[in-house]
Interface confidence: low
């Protein structure tokens, strides 16, 4: 329904607190540069005047939208060319362009310093003090960081944060309580913002239908139980909710996942029998929970999937008169049966069926030439099997360390023009997949590996288009996002590389290196492992191997040395002559 | 095909009872949530009542909470409604659905008249 001013419905809707968040949230991921005070001040002047509209509707600009009245506010910011350059041309036009302007100038890969935690007892102190604005730091610094992260579920984590900090400050050994609950906080939060990008990707890319899809999909795996209508009204809500948040209509978006979450308690016997524990928590955790809540228990006597979709006589007529709903009867079908495929694995397949369809059902004979589609689906289906096994393996055999490692020395092959940084960065995140999937039942390996990687390679993707420098990256970031991921698989060595010079000094190393986290020293190792791969492309694992050896060996004497500085300018020398040889 | 039928409507007393029934074909019923609603005269659609696959989940309308049972029997591929307490405001249309699907079937009156 119409309501005379959107600014109060969202503030009664959301409530204060909430609606702080958000609008901090917002600000945050539209102008990353910013400073925390600059935008609570925007903030509390937003909330102040929702409040004024909350009290009157028909006050002064309380019927503007929601975009008019957050642009016109990021539109006053002073100094706003200066700090953000062209962005400050986005001022000059009107909505809807002006936020679709903002929304293009969102940076995935801002020029910010890491986020650093406090040291555990600071933290407490700060948090103490001002538990408010220490939870407005918290949302500032990641949607900033992330300017696509999932508003509601940033909420989520803020609210596990402000728990882990009232719990662990009390205790008396607060660093040891404090590091293993934040860093678990970190990591969910982490996957939950390459997948969110993910998502936000594909409705910027190939729109609401492509997203509408992936949530056919996934929710037919997790709800096997419920029917097609069932499913497609809580896809169609789902994509309405993303396209909310990846169009930066934050409470709009907070407030329909609100509503989704309860129509879905409300709805529980016709969608799935574990929803109960989900539907007994406070809001945030309540939708957490329901978005990640196990797969139902599949129905015992679902029929063969061909009986529909290939032995029945009217598949082409079907398909002609409604082909939208037929292959989404299709995709619902075959991934209610299939919760140990990945969703892109079951996008692939519908792809493959709805290519089969048309081409056979232009033929004379169409059913002669659909009926082995089934059958044409098994190369699709190894592919990915094979990769997670093959992959596993390694990743037993090396541990996490020595898989990112491997996966590095893969993709700088692949693509030896894209950056260190990106590649170390990269080849980090698909090497966790191991410890996040690999331990997982062997039925549900596959969808975490796969989709789990074709988010992180979206990520590669976002940060190869600003600055395109691999043909076969762009090659496999051009196509469709389910095929990615094969495509990225299947590059091999990119034989159109010139190698790169040695340059002793990529490979010197200092004394401060010792005293470095053990995270850092990895990078640093990996930043020395990419640039050799850069200068011989085709070095054998063998040859790689000697050398990080030498390289760990060589640090680790030097570290242990009375005087570290002399054993790095003296060793450090003779290893650069070996590595050089050892790859001659 | 998808077949829903539904019996045991009829004219009661208010505080009188009935039991309706329906009957499924066409489709794997134990698979499906099943859900009964109701159309009074000159009304829209009302959700009755709602029971799960495997029924562990059972949920009702407020209108008819403590009044109204959900029952299914898989093998038979029965769906239920024990009706209780009936009061006028009950008299409709009662159609059995899939899910929480349109009703696709006749459905049966129920009236609820002294």
């Known amino acids: 329904e119409a309501h005379k001013s959107e600014i109060a419905h969202r503030y009664n809707d959301l409530g204060e607190q909430h609606f702080k968040g958000l609008v901090l949230i917002a600000f945050s991921q539209y102008l990353q540069k910013c400073s925390y005070d600059e935008h609570a001040k925007l903030v509390q002047e937003v909330t102040d005047f929702a409040k004024t509209c909350v009290a009157d509707e028909s006050a002064a600009n309380c019927d503007k939208s929601l975009h008019t009245l957050f642009g016109d506010k990021l539109c006053a910011i002073p100094n706003l060319r200066e700090n953000y350059g062209e962005l400050a041309d986005c001022c000059t036009k009107q909505e809807p362009e002006r936020n679709e302007c903002f929304l293009q100038h969102k940076d995935d890969n801002p020029s910010l310093p890491p986020f650093e935690r406090p040291e555990a007892e600071a933290m407490c102190t700060s948090f103490k003090e001002n538990p408010t604005t220490f939870m407005g730091h918290y949302l500032h610094e990641v949607a900033r960081r992330h300017p696509y992260f999932y508003a509601p579920e940033l909420l989520y984590y803020a609210e596990q944060y402000n728990e882990i900090l009232t719990q662990c400050c009390a205790e008396a050994d607060k660093e040891s309580c404090l590091t293993p609950k934040l860093d678990g906080v970190k990591e969910k939060a982490l996957v939950s913002s390459v997948r969110q990008r993910m998502k936000c990707s594909s409705m910027q890319k190939f729109g609401e239908r492509a997203f509408k899809a992936w949530a056919v999909a996934r929710l037919s795996q997790t709800f096997p139980n419920a029917d097609f209508a069932e499913i497609t009204k809580l896809a169609t809500d789902l994509t309405k909710v993303n396209k909310e948040c990846c169009h930066g209509d934050l409470l709009e978006c907070a407030d329909d996942r609100a509503e989704l979450a309860k129509y879905m308690c409300e709805n529980q016997a016709t969608i799935s029998s574990k929803l109960q524990t989900c539907c007994d928590k406070p809001l945030l955790k309540k939708a957490h929970c329901l978005s990640e809540v196990e797969h139902d228990t599949m129905p015992a006597d679902l029929p063969a999937i061909a009986a529909d979709f290939v032995e029945d006589q009217e598949v082409c007529k079907n398909y002609a008169e409604a082909k939208d709903v037929f292959l989404g009867t299709f995709l619902y079908e075959y991934s209610r049966r299939h919760p140990d495929y990945s969703v892109s694995l079951l996008l692939r397949l519908a792809k493959k069926y709805e290519a089969t369809l048309e081409k056979c059902c232009a033929e004379a004979n169409p059913p002669a030439c659909y009926g082995t589609v089934l059958a044409e689906f098994q190369p699709l289906v190894e592919e990915p099997k094979n990769l997670v096994k093959t992959n596993c393996d390694l990743y037993e055999k090396l541990g996490e360390y020595g898989f990112q490692n491997a996966i590095l020395v893969r993709y700088t092959q692949k693509a030896p023009q894209v950056s260190t940084p990106t590649l170390v960065e990269a080849a980090r995140n698909l090497g966790r997949v191991g410890t996040k999937c690999c331990t997982l039942p062997e039925d549900q390996r596959l969808p975490c590996v796969e989709d789990y990687l074709s988010a992180i390679l979206n990520r590669v993707c976002l940060l190869h288009e600003k600055t395109p420098v691999s043909e076969h990256v762009t090659k496999c970031c051009s196509g469709s996002l389910v095929e990615r991921r094969p495509c990225f698989s299947a590059l091999t060595v990119d034989e159109t590389y010139v190698p790169k010079e040695f340059k002793a000094e990529t490979f010197t190393f200092h004394s401060d290196i010792c005293t470095l986290p053990e995270k850092e020293k990895q990078i640093k190792k990996q930043t020395a492992l990419a640039e050799l791969v850069k200068h011989k492309p085709k070095a054998t694992a063998e040859q790689l191997k000697t050398v990080m050896d030498d390289f760990a060996q060589f640090l680790d004497t030097c570290c242990k040395a009375a005087d570290k500085d002399t054993c790095f300018s003296t060793e450090g020398p003779n290893l650069v002559t070996r590595c050089k040889d050892a790859l001659a | 095909q998808v077949q829903l039928a539904e019996s045991g409507g009829g004219l009661v007393q208010p505080g009188g009872s009935l039991r309706l029934t329906c009957t499924a074909s066409?489709?794997?019923?134990?698979?499906?949530?099943m859900s009964w609603v109701r159309q009074a005269p000159g009304e829209g659609l009302e959700w009755v009542s709602a029971?799960?696959?495997?029924?562990?989940?059972?949920r009702y309308a407020d209108s008819v909470k403590g009044r109204f049972t959900i029952s299914r029997d898989n093998a038979k591929k029965m769906l239920y409604l024990e009706m209780n307490s009936l009061k006028s405001e009950d008299t409709a249309v009662y159609y059995c659905?899939?899910?929480?699907?349109?009703?696709a079937s006749q459905g049966t009156q129920v009236t609820v008249s002294s």
């Open positions: 066409g489709f794997t019923f134990g698979s499906f949530g």
């Open positions: 659905v899939i899910g929480r699907g349109s009703p």
């Open positions: 029971i799960s696959a495997d029924s562990s989940d059972k």
